[in-house]
Interface confidence: low
């Protein structure tokens, strides 16, 4: 008789990543009978919410409901109706909301309250909206990539061989770059983590992990740019800012009030004799790099070694997955290949930044000018952060893998967050052996 597949016994989960620049909704799916197996959860959908990050709705909270509608409706379509009530929904807000909370706890609470009320209107099992810590963001990103790479399992994986195969169970470090913060997380080699704030202990699938993590608030690519502008306008003698991080011929007017809106620029704030200034691009990688380095205070370190701003960083160890904006920016610049050396990346950045703005606009006609104009800065910032900030070298550069997706799931903190909240990563190794995707009779 012909084999017939039994109805799929699957479960779903939804996580909203409320980042500083935008919100994304992720839908995950896994076989119900294999919840505790490693690598069985996979992403089936990503929906990018149209509009800015939720922190920007502080003066118009009544619009949050409409803002979230499209993606929540998409989730309704993707997940079978019979599963709606048992599908958990989690919203995690990151550095954009951390910054808002620093300015005003009251305003941050107000935004989260409206988000929670909006999400409660859907037929899913809403589990709450909260601002996750930088430490959590780093940790969950690390869990995500190592879960997807199969690093937590001693067993033969049922899924196909993943990229970045290293034939061992040594975990990958995680490098995450957002708009408002950046995280570095990895297992150091036999190294005491000198700063307790940066130490995490996990027991996953029967193995102990001592993990280092740090989140640098204000050092995401967007906030780093605001910092750089605030620093540089201090020494400009009037309202013209010659900026090496923008293409030659690029021009943009910036409101001083916007510049000083974020807590990230407070240290550079001063009374300026103008309300607006004009950025004029001069497109010089070397000068841009120099300017960015001034954001990293490397003169003070109370530990055996530091990243910057007095933050402990152990010696780098093993391979690293660099994701989120690390990946998006380098992908745009066509620099994600494992074969591209650090020297080559620098060379390409020099050429890219020097290209006239008019030429760039023509070459990338389909890209929004707001994003297009910032790739020179972002690419240079990534190099500066990885090389001078985290102390990667030309040699260790080959250990950085720019990762967008692994096995169809986005690299990022959301999957790790859901795995943790749904208790799908057991402390001990499950006894059962993994089965194939579905059972046939």
């Amino acid at each position: 008789t012909q084999n017939k597949a039994l109805p799929e016994n699957v479960k779903y989960g939804i996580v909203l990543d409320a980042g500083s620049s935008h919100t994304s909704l992720y839908i995950y799916k896994w076989p119900a009978e294999k919840e505790n197996d490693t690598g069985v959860v996979h992403q089936v959908e990503e929906c990018r919410v149209k509009g800015p990050g939720i922190s920007k709705f502080v003066q118009k909270v009544n619009e949050i409901g409409i803002y979230l509608t499209d993606c929540m409706e998409r989730a309704r379509e993707v997940i079978p109706r019979s599963q709606h009530q048992e599908t958990p929904v989690y919203l995690g807000a990151t550095a954009g909301m951390r910054l808002l909370r620093m300015e005003s706890e009251e305003l941050a609470d107000r935004v989260l309250d409206v988000v929670e009320r909006s999400l409660s209107n859907y037929p899913f099992d809403f589990q709450g909206a909260r601002i996750i810590t930088g430490q959590e963001e780093g940790a969950y990103g690390w869990i995500t990539i190592n879960y997807l790479l199969g690093k937590f399992s001693q067993k033969t994986r049922w899924f196909s061989i993943v990229p970045y195969e290293t034939n061992n169970q040594e975990t990958f470090g995680a490098l995450d770059l957002g708009g408002a913060s950046t995280q570095v997380t990895f297992v150091p080699q036999n190294q005491t983590i000198e700063s307790p704030d940066n130490a995490l202990q996990f027991r996953l699938y029967g193995k102990d992990y001592n993990v280092y993590t740090h989140s640098f608030l204000c050092y995401g690519k967007d906030q780093a740019l605001w910092q750089k502008l605030a620093k540089d306008i201090q020494v400009a003698s009037n309202e013209i800012l010659r900026d090496p991080c923008f293409h030659p011929g690029y021009k943009k007017v910036v409101n001083v009030s916007d510049l000083y809106k974020t807590p990230c620029t407070k240290r550079f704030e001063m009374t300026l004799p103008f309300q607006q200034f004009e950025i004029q691009g001069i497109g010089n990688y070397q000068q841009c790099h120099q300017s960015i380095l001034e954001l990293f205070n490397t003169s003070y370190c109370p530990y055996s070694q530091c990243a910057f701003n007095g933050i402990f960083l152990p010696p780098l160890q093993g391979d690293f997955g660099a994701f989120s904006a690390f990946y998006f920016v380098m992908k745009f610049l066509n620099l994600t290949s494992e074969k591209v050396s650090q020297e080559k990346v620098t060379e390409m950045m020099k050429k890219f930044c020097a290209q006239p703005w008019e030429e760039i606009k023509t070459s990338y006609a389909g890209v929004k000018e707001k994003y297009l104009s910032e790739y020179c800065f972002s690419g240079t910032y990534i190099l500066s952060l990885l090389l001078q900030g985290y102390h990667f070298t030309a040699d260790s550069w080959e250990h950085i893998h720019f990762i967008g997706k692994i096995q169809g799931s986005d690299a990022g903190w959301t999957l790790g967050y859901m795995l943790n909240l749904t208790n799908m990563i057991p402390a001990e190794q499950p006894l059962s052996t993994p089965l194939s995707h579905s059972t046939y009779v």
Partner: antibody, heavy 119, light 109 residues
Framework: EVQLVQSGAEVKKPGATVKISCKVS????????MHWVQQAPGKGLEWMGR????????KYAEKFKNRVTITADTSTNTVYMELSSLRSEDTAVYYC????????????WGQGVMVTVSS | DIVMTQSPDLAVSLGERATINCRTQ??????????MNWYQQKPGQPPKLLIY???SLASGVPDRFSGSGSGTDFTLTISSLQAEDVAVYYC????????FGGGTKVEIK
């Protein structure tokens, strides 16, 4: 080859307004900042102001701020400088000039327009 | 505005070196780029760019012209004065909008 051709000489009475044009050929004015420079007889060069035709943004020197208006017409690739409340000390040659990336060598000047203010 | 002061007029013999100085009230450097230009102007003509970014020779300009300096002190040098170099020379900063120096007249002694 980029060329800047300015309008003809003008004679004006004190208190009047003069409007000078500068037509650019060989490239779009939106690729440049367009500057105006004054030079009184036997005197040095004095920067008056500039326009970014791409965004219609202007900047003026403090000395001329209340009397000068620089405009641009991208459809005809022409920039204009209007100076009001003319006085005898405004008698000068007025030059238009281009600047692409500030400080770099993409520098073209018009031939200049002589404006005489006399009662 | 950035105020600029140029050295007084000078008379130099043909074939001799001519040096013109320009001082700015505040720096015209920005991240390693120096926004100082030098122009030559002859009677009845618009200014002609000689030197840009303090020391780069504009195209078509003879190499007897050179520029040097950074920060607030700058020099234009004509290594061997020729008859056709008789003109007024202006320094100009373009770090913050434009400002010109007062001009230096170069004549033959």
């Amino acid at each position: 080859e980029v060329q800047l051709v300015q309008s003809g000489a003008e004679v004006k009475k004190p208190g009047a307004t003069v409007k000078i044009s500068c037509k650019v050929s060989g490239d779009s004015i939106t690729a440049y900042f367009m500057h105006w420079v004054q030079q009184a007889p036997g005197k040095g060069l004095e920067w008056m102001g500039r326009i970014d035709p791409d965004h219609e943004r202007t900047k003026y020197a403090e000395k001329f701020k209340n009397r000068v208006t620089i405009t641009a017409d991208t459809s005809t690739n022409t920039v204009y400088m209007e100076l009001s409340s003319l006085r005898s000390e405004d008698t000068a040659v007025y030059y238009c000039a281009t600047e692409r990336v500030p400080g770099f060598e993409t520098d073209y000047w018009g031939q200049g327009v002589m404006v005489t203010v006399s009662s | 505005d950035i105020v600029m002061t140029q050295s007084p007029d000078l008379a130099v013999s043909l074939g001799e070196r001519a040096t013109i100085n320009c001082r700015t009230q505040q720096t015209v450097d920005h991240y390693g780029t120096t926004y100082m230009n030098w122009y030559q102007q002859k009677p009845g003509q618009p200014p002609k760019l000689l030197i840009y970014l303090a020391s780069s020779l504009a195209s078509g300009v003879p190499d007897r012209f050179s520029g040097s300096g950074s920060g607030t002190d700058f020099t234009l040098t004509i290594s061997s004065l020729q008859a056709e170099d008789v003109a007024v020379y202006y320094c100009q900063q373009s770090r913050n909008l434009w400002t010109f120096g007062g001009g230096t007249k170069v004549e033959i002694k």
